[in-house]
């Protein structure tokens, strides 16, 4: 603890200029003090003044006011400093002392004489109210004050509290009364050595050196650190934890950068015509009458749906066409006969059957033969019937479909899978990508089937946590961790709820 | 009693960057109410604080030696580290880790025994 | 940069008092630590907030600290203090020794 115990003389009165041996002083009684100050006791006693003691010079003669002085000789009020903890009660001893001699240090004069003593035992507090006293005897009074502050960076009731303020490393606050601290703004903790961190900043992604900043670990993003950062490449996906892609929708692959939805993303059908989705990247235009072309994009002409019956010619016309009709029909598409079976109108050994009491008829044609009066040689290609750009091949009585590669099905309907070849070596997986299949491999080859053998082995060390598979191949050099149910992350170190939907690439 | 243990090579070529870890133990690194600091002291010379962390990860450093100097923690490993970049001879040091105490007002009570650390071609 | 300036040297008998000073711009409004730090070994700190010793360090060893300076004070030195002792101080957010003193 650190003190200073304040004595302040106020007035001391001698109106007779006497001695306390009843002498009188000649001229006057040139007046100081001597004042010892030590711990308590019942019955004061000569010995060290065990708490401090203090001389004056010459502050006056016979009776005299004493006025504050801070500085110089004569200090008012005199200061008696301690090391220790102030224990709260005290013996106080004020003598008054003549001196013939250097007015200021008359301790050192012969001569000097005791005018009067007074002697305080008590209690006291350690603050900032003086107490105030006045002693009478017969010849002298005394009035004085007195009380017990802390030195600089000193609290408590007894002045044993040490606080600096302070504004650095270990602490940012300043003292209260009491001796407790008291933190600056932008700081907490017991001793204000912790920063508060920018409003909303996340307690477990963000922390900050300063107040009022906001510093992201690893993974996270964003003023408040409360945006997960996906995986590298992640184009069309989003994460919940750090490093994670899981593809909006319509979208798929590793990186979301597979296009699920063409149909919808690129509206490559043409004309009215309707898309469907067939694999990434891969869609099927269905044409409405009158247009062909993989995304329907060609006009047919308006003859090419043969609308004229009864072998009517077809002419084309501006938005329409026209049907030039042979003998014996009419009407828009020659439709209506003004033959009846008399006139022998089924070709290719059609049957003539009577209507309509003989005033028409219908031909029951032979197979491969078709049209009113069975004039048309039967073309099953007429109606399109393969999809996905397929040819179309008349053979005899049927037709078939010469699918493009990667279609198959009776109508080329079917998308192949570019992994059905198993065109991954040494048990390599396959995965159907935009641009044809990829191999993941099994530890110890690479290469795009999976054909080579490596020497190092990316997977040796055991990148892949919680029972990971680890695999090489899927990208030059590299490794891929295939996470068991539970856990995601390039080496499956992040738990979660979630299945992962795909392996990580390392 | 905490106890920490410098670790790391005692060689280093200039220009290169010198990486050293302190391991601690009889104690959590995360423990609130500690900085976890170095210092180092060339061959015969004084001592220099480089800097220190906080378990939360907040960083200090001395300006002197800011553009160069990188500490970390790994909490799950009650390790941490020290990475100084375009080393030359002038950095030549006993290398001591060292816990700060906040309720010692800094003072650090806690030393590792140090490791030369010596930048040579 | 904040600067701590140290004798180099303080001779005493055994038995004497050894005072070490340390100084520095308002250094009585910054706490300080001592260390002592024997040949071949890593430092002890013997004094924190100026004048507070940690446990197991003897009563012999005070310090003081106002206005410019700083002050350890060993009182009945013996031979085990002979020793290099530096002083230490926080400027805002960086760490600062004082040059070190040898007392022989």
């Known amino acids: 603890g650190s003190g200073i115990f304040q004595l302040r003389l106020q007035e001391f009165v001698n109106q007779r200029g006497m001695l306390a041996n009843g002498q009188s002083c000649e001229p006057g009684c040139r007046t100081f003090f001597r004042i010892c100050l030590k711990h308590f006791q019942a019955t004061f006693s000569e010995g060290p003044c065990t708490f401090g003691n203090v001389s004056t010079p010459v502050l006056g003669t016979n009776s005299f006011v004493v006025r504050d002085k801070n500085s110089g000789s004569g200090r008012n009020p005199l200061q008696l400093p301690f090391n220790f903890t102030w224990p709260g009660t005290f013996s106080l001893n004020i003598q008054a002392w003549h001196t013939p001699g250097d007015d200021l240090r008359p301790e050192t004069s012969p001569g000097n004489s005791l005018i009067s003593q007074i002697i305080i035992q008590g209690s006291l507090a350690v603050g900032k109210i003086w107490r105030t006293d006045e002693q009478n005897d017969t010849l002298t009074r005394l009035s004085y004050s007195y009380r017990v502050i802390c030195s600089d960076n000193y609290y408590g009731e007894s002045c044993s509290r040490l606080c600096k303020k302070r504004d650095d490393h270990f602490g940012h606050y300043e003292c209260q009364p009491d001796g407790s601290l008291s933190c600056l703004p932008g700081w907490t903790g017991k001793y204000c050595d912790q920063p508060i961190c920018l409003s909303g900043c996340h307690e477990q992604n963000g922390y900050c050196s300063k107040p009022d900043e906001c510093i992201c670990r690893p993974g996270w993003q964003g003023r408040l650190c409360n945006e997960c950062i996906p995986h590298n490449g992640c184009r069309h996906g989003t994460c919940s934890i750090p490093w994670q892609c899981a593809c909006d929708e319509g979208w798929g692959g590793l990186f979301c950068d597979q296009d699920l939805n063409y149909c919808t993303h690129h509206s490559p059908c043409k004309n009215g015509s309707t898309c469907s989705n067939s694999g990434p990247k891969g869609y099927t235009c269905t044409c409405l009458p009158g247009y062909t072309g993989e995304h329907c994009e060609l006009g047919l002409s308006k003859c090419a749906s043969n609308p004229c019956r009864n072998g009517g010619s077809c002419k084309d016309q501006e938005n329409s066409y026209h049907c030039l009709c042979p003998p014996g029909y009419y009407g828009q598409h020659c439709e209506h006969s003004t033959l009846t079976c008399a006139d022998s109108p089924c070709f290719n050994g059609g049957s003539c059957r009577e209507r309509n009491q003989g005033s028409s008829y219908a031909c029951e044609c032979p197979p491969n033969f078709t049209g009113s009066n069975c004039e048309k040689k039967v073309d099953r290609c007429t109606s399109n019937p393969c999809a996905n750009g397929g040819q179309c091949q008349n053979r005899g009585p049927s037709r078939t479909c010469r699918c493009r590669p990667g279609f198959t099905g009776t109508h080329c309907e079917l998308h192949i899978s570019d992994c059905a070849r198993s065109p991954c070596a040494h048990g390599g997986t396959c995965h159907d990508l935009e641009n044809g299949p990829v191999c993941t491999c099994p530890a110890g080859f690479s290469g795009r089937r999976c054909e080579v053998r490596i020497t190092h082995d990316a997977c040796a060390s055991g990148p892949c946590f919680n029972g990971a598979t680890c695999y090489t191949g899927l990208s030059p050099n590299n490794f891929v961790c295939n996470c068991p149910y539970g856990f995601v992350g390039s080496r499956c170190e992040f738990p979660v709820g979630l299945p992962p939907s795909f392996p990580w690439v390392a | 009693e905490v106890q920490l243990q410098e670790s790391g090579p005692g060689l280093v070529k200039p220009s290169e960057t010198l990486s050293l870890t302190c391991t601690v133990s009889?104690?959590?690194?995360?423990?609130?109410?500690?900085?976890w600091g170095w210092i180092r002291q060339p061959p015969g010379k004084g001592l220099e604080w480089i800097g220190d962390?906080?378990?939360?990860?907040?960083?200090y450093y001395n300006p002197s030696l800011k553009n160069r100097v990188t500490i970390s923690v790994d909490t799950s490993k009650n390790q941490f580290s020290l990475k100084l970049s375009s080393v030359t001879a002038a950095d030549t040091a006993v290398y001591y880790c060292a816990r700060e105490e906040v309720i010692l007002g800094g003072g650090a009570d806690q030393w590792g025994q140090g490791t030369l650390v010596t930048v040579s071609s | 940069s904040y600067e701590l300036t140290q004798p180099p040297s303080v001779s005493v008998s055994p038995g004497q008092t050894a005072s070490i000073t340390c100084s520095g711009e308002s250094l009585g409004d910054k706490y300080v630590s001592w260390y002592q730090q024997k040949p071949g070994q890593s430092p002890v700190l013997v004094i924190y907030e100026d004048s507070k010793r940690p446990s197991g360090i003897p009563e012999r060893f005070s310090g003081s600290n106002s206005g410019d300076t700083a002050t350890l004070t060993i009182s009945g030195t013996q031979a085990m203090d002979e020793a290099d002792y530096y002083c230490q101080a926080w400027d805002g957010e960086t760490g600062v020794f004082g040059s070190g003193t040898k007392v022989t």
């Open positions: 962390i906080y378990y939360t990860g907040n960083t």
């Open positions: 009889g104690g959590s690194i995360s423990s609130s109410g500690y900085y």
